[in-house]
Interface confidence: low
């Protein structure tokens, strides 16, 4: 079976800097190399307005949803039809394709699945899902997200969002 | 060496129902979908169906489509083909297979489905 | 259905190629395999399966490429023994697919 992990699934990241999602995976079936593909799709909330706005009827909605299921990710957790899907690259042995969206920008996999962005830009906010196929092994968790939010620097907003963490916390 | 041994095949009567077994040996099985294949006599290769490796995934040809099962038992390394109401045009050569893009063949069990 | 050639010949120690084209996509890919039958009613060998890669115990005449959506079986030094019916397979997303075989003659 495939096992597909993003070790760090948030990111802020300032407008024009370069950023990497990482991701791994496992695999029990070695003998050839996966397609790792990147997709991304738009936030299904906006991500930037909300943390601007804490006490909103939307925000204090959500917070309920999530008291009743703690997994539940409002921004992340809605139907493809109601929001921008895009296949960003994919990687088959050495060969990286760009998605046509993409094609221009200096985006690459590197390693064995991870994305890099050597400068972001404004639209690149959302959730980049990292998937993992081989024909030869159909079986297991191949798919696992990051979320990446771009922030421009303005007076006006902070570098990093209220309650948005830019990795992983260690207790 | 990938080994892949059928049977249950033989003389069928038409609504009538086979199960053919797979067994398989020499490979890591529950890393591998397993499919099965039939040729009718004189013709080419159709697909009838497949399972994934943990056996959460089935799927069918249209021509089996509500008359097949597959399933496997990945402690015994083996999979099963249950086919009910059969007919006529369900005669031929059950080949046992391994991968989603076939890479191992199994020698075949002969069915023939006549009064 | 996969579409390859009804059959192809050619002489000892020539080229042969072999294609086929109307797989399925799998997250954008297309994959193929090549399977030799000898004779109707005896088991089938894979001669090449995702693409290109080939069995150990096949011989390296035997290889397999991709371009686009068609796959091609290429036979460098085709030996009498190579003559029988080969198919293609691939897949969609809900069922497994054969070409109806190419008779190659030698």
């Known amino acids: 079976a495939i096992q597909v992990t993003v070790p760090d699934p948030y990111h802020v990241v300032i407008l024009f800097q370069p950023v990497t999602l990482h991701c791994t995976y496992q695999m029990s079936n070695t003998l050839t190399a996966p397609i790792v593909i990147w997709k991304y799709k738009s936030f299904c909330r906006d991500r930037v307005a909300d943390a601007f706005s804490p006490a909103s009827v939307d925000n204090q909605l959500n917070a309920q949803l999530a008291a009743g299921n703690p997994g539940y990710n409002p921004y992340v957790e809605c139907q493809d039809s109601v929001r921008t899907v895009r296949v960003v690259a994919t990687k088959q042995g050495n060969a990286v394709t760009l998605g046509d969206y993409y094609q221009g920008r200096r985006i690459t996999i590197t390693g064995n699945a991870d994305l890099t962005f050597e400068q972001t830009a404004w639209g690149d906010s959302g959730v980049y899902y990292c998937s993992v196929v081989s024909a030869q092994d159909l079986d297991g968790n191949n798919e696992a997200y990051a979320e990446l939010i771009v922030l421009g620097r303005t007076s006006e907003a902070p570098e990093l969002l209220p309650g948005f963490r830019a990795g992983p916390l260690e207790d | 060496a990938v080994t892949l041994d059928e049977s249950g095949g033989g003389l069928q009567t038409p609504g009538g129902a086979l199960s053919l077994v797979c067994e398989a040996s020499?490979?890591?099985?529950?890393?591998?979908?397993m499919q099965w294949v039939r040729q009718a006599p004189g013709k080419g290769l159709e697909w009838v169906a497949g399972?994934?490796?943990?056996?959460?995934?089935?799927r069918y040809g249209s021509a089996v489509q509500g008359r097949a099962t597959i399933s496997r038992d990945n402690g015994q390394s083996t999979v099963r083909l249950q086919l009910n109401n059969l007919r006529a045009e369900d005669t031929g050569t059950y080949y046992c297979?391994?991968?989603?893009?076939?890479?191992?063949w199994g020698h075949g069990t002969e069915v023939i489905v006549s009064t | 259905a996969l579409t390859q050639p009804a059959s192809v010949s050619a002489n000892p120690g020539e080229t042969v190629k072999i294609t086929c084209s109307g797989g399925?996509?799998?997250?954008?890919?297309?994959?193929y395999s090549w399977h030799q039958q000898k004779s109707p009613g005896s088991a089938p060998v894979t001669v090449i399966?995702?693409?290109?890669q080939r069995p150990s115990d096949i011989p390296s005449r035997f290889s397999g490429s991709k371009s686009g959506s068609t796959a091609t079986l290429t036979i460098t030094g085709v030996q009498a023994e190579d003559e029988a019916v080969y198919f293609c397979?691939?897949?969609?997303?809900?069922?497994?697919?054969f070409g109806a075989g190419t008779t190659l003659t030698v």
């Open positions: 399972i994934s490796g943990a056996g959460s995934s089935t």
């Open positions: 399925g996509s799998y997250y954008g890919s297309y994959y």
């Open positions: 297979a391994r991968g989603s893009l076939i890479d191992a």
């Open positions: 399966y995702e693409n290109n």
């Open positions: 397979g691939s897949y969609d997303s809900s069922a497994g697919l």
């Open positions: 020499g490979f890591d099985f529950s890393s591998h979908e």
